[in-house]
């Protein structure tokens, strides 16, 4: 004669609230001849939940008809779940007694969960913009899921990071959970096209996580380097300097000339390129006059970019012999 | 053991609706989710989108959104696809397929297969 | 969307063999890349999952490799079980774009 087992397949069963439960139990023998019972809990201070031959149950439910002589399916559905029911659940056997029925066996329970999805991912960034080779902190929160126990993965461009801090309130037992988590990213210089990236995976989600992203571009400043220069050829009576600001981020940048300390207001030509790694380069051209009187002309390039502190370049103009010659006599 | 067993071919005219049935046994059908697979007479596969059992949420491909719809019927196991206004070109191989994922929640691919359904449409 | 491309798109081999089929995504999809088998006429089988993990029950004769856009599935010493046709599918967000597939033969 085959022992009998009591088979709940489930060991965690996520539910909705308002939604219909399935509680799975079968038994693989029809004896001892005695019920079966549904209980939550386990000791003296265990629910019933349902018994087909007493009582009122009427949010229960049986999945099959316990009145059929070979049944051996003993699942019941609760309807209208709510936080209340959560609980483990327990199909027990009972062997027909006089003058009371004794319990036999009980099958290994289903832990009954409310199941609630994560809320997408928000990442936020820092307050103020930082240079590379320094360490910027990011966040990400996530709220209202259930049950607690969840995944949070943090990428820079697909790869990913390992130096990060994460927290699951409350601690104790909830209806619904928050996930926040702070990850360190170093900052490289060509940073200004990517992106973080919180991945928060759930057992609601059934594999496909949830995503937020933050781009590096909001928390990083790439300071620029400058490089002043005087070009070979002049025009006429004026040597053409130029100014290079190379590789800064963000754009904003206030370029001014001065000549022998003294600022230069007039109009000068530039032009804004932007490169592969998102980064801005700007060349400024400025005009000088050249005449005899001018033997030390110092110029100045100062740039000053995103509210930072002013960084300049100096230049002292090589203006030879021959060119003070070409410019007096050009000089009517 | 698990399965997922599929309704039987279908023959439908052009402008009618076809309702194919995915039956999950051997787990928790909640558990998992439900993806759906067309497969055209000597053709590749394409995945038209998923429904999640437990919100009850479908994400659908571009191609199949509008007529093509996915429905559950927890209770009993079975996930659905109900194709409206069919057409010849949707004559296919459909099938169902449960959604895996690692101990982290992650899904990596496609565990369990019904055997598929056929449906032929013709006027 | 992100497309994947198989190459070849067919392939005729003798029993003991070794084969490479190749998939190539259309952008980075890091290592979320999953291969199927499929016998004419049957569903696909689950073969090769996250670009190089086997998926339970399946020989070690075959083996996946790569990552980022570049990946390959190797069947060494091909048994007469393993003739079909073979998917890639890619996991990397929405939608999962399955490869043209390869249809391998006995030659």
């Known amino acids: 004669e085959e022992e009998l087992q009591m088979i709940q397949p489930e060991k965690l069963l996520l539910v909705t609230v308002g939604k219909t439960a399935t509680l799975h139990c079968t038994v693989t023998s029809l004896l001892p001849v005695g019920p079966v019972l549904w209980f939550r809990g386990v000791g003296p201070g265990r629910e019933l939940i349902y018994n087909q031959k007493e009582g009122h149950f009427p949010r229960v439910t049986t999945v099959s008809d316990l009145t059929k002589r070979n049944n051996m399916d003993f699942s019941i559905r609760i309807s209208s779940i709510t936080p209340a029911d959560v609980g483990t659940y327990y199909c027990v056997k009972f062997r027909k007694g006089s003058p009371e029925n004794v319990e036999f066996k009980s099958g290994p329970g289903t832990e009954m969960a409310l199941g609630a999805k994560p809320s997408a991912p928000v990442v936020l960034g820092p307050a103020a913009r930082t240079t590379p080779e320094h360490t910027v902190s990011f966040t990400c929160e996530s709220h209202g899921f259930s049950p607690r126990d969840i995944t949070l993965k943090w990428f820079k461009n697909g790869n990913e990071l390992s130096d990060f801090q994460t927290n699951v309130d409350p601690t104790g037992q909830s209806v619904a959970y928050s996930i926040r988590s702070t990850a360190r990213v170093v900052l490289d210089p060509w940073d200004v096209r990517s992106q973080v990236i919180c991945e928060v995976a759930h057992v609601t989600l059934q594999g496909d996580p949830l995503r937020g992203t933050a781009n590096l571009s909001e928390a990083i400043r790439v300071p620029p380097t400058l490089e002043v220069t005087q070009q070979p050829m002049r025009v006429g009576n004026q040597v053409n300097v130029t100014c290079q600001v190379r590789k800064f981020y963000p754009q904003s940048l206030q370029l001014t000339w001065s000549e022998n300390g003294n600022v230069c207001q007039r109009e000068t030509a530039s032009t804004l390129t932007e490169n592969k790694d998102g980064t801005y380069n700007w060349t400024s051209w400025f005009l000088v006059n050249i005449s005899d009187q001018r033997d030390d002309v110092v110029l100045t390039c100062q740039v000053k970019h995103d509210g930072q502190l002013a960084v300049s370049k100096r230049l002292a103009l090589e203006v030879t012999v021959h060119q003070k010659d070409q410019s007096s006599d050009a000089t009517p | 053991q698990i399965q997922l067993v599929q309704s039987g071919p279908e023959l439908k005219k052009p402008g009618e609706t076809v309702k194919i049935s995915c039956k999950a046994s051997g787990y928790t059908f909640t558990d998992y989710g439900v993806n759906w697979v067309k497969q055209g007479p000597g053709k590749d596969l394409q995945w038209m989108g998923w429904v999640n059992t437990n919100t009850r949420e479908s994400t659908y491909v571009e191609d199949f959104k509008g007529r093509f719809a996915f429905s559950l019927e927890t209770s009993a196991s079975t996930a659905y696809l109900q194709i409206n206004n069919l057409k010849n070109e949707d004559s296919s191989t459909y099938f169902c397929?449960?959604?895996?994922?690692?101990?982290?929640?992650?899904?990596?691919?496609?565990?369990?297969w019904g055997q598929g359904t056929s449906v032929t449409v013709s006027s | 969307d992100i497309q994947m491309t198989q190459s070849p798109a067919s392939l005729s081999a003798s029993v003991g063999e070794t084969v490479t089929i190749t998939c190539r995504a259309s952008?980075?999809?890091?290592?979320?890349l999953t291969w199927y088998k499929q016998k004419q006429g049957k569903s696909p089988q689950l073969l090769v999952y996250?670009?190089?993990t086997l998926a339970e029950g399946v020989p070690s004769r075959f083996s996946g490799s790569g990552s980022g856009t570049q990946f390959s599935l190797k069947i060494n010493s091909l048994q007469p079980e393993d003739f079909g046709s073979y998917y890639c599918?890619?996991?990397?967000?929405?939608?999962?774009?399955f490869g043209g597939g390869t249809k391998l033969e006995i030659k």
């Open positions: 599918q890619h996991h990397y967000g929405s939608p999962r774009t």
């Open positions: 952008e980075n999809i890091y290592s979320y």
């Open positions: 397929a449960r959604g895996a994922y690692d101990a982290y929640y992650y899904y990596y691919g496609m565990d369990y």
């Open positions: 996250n670009a190089k």
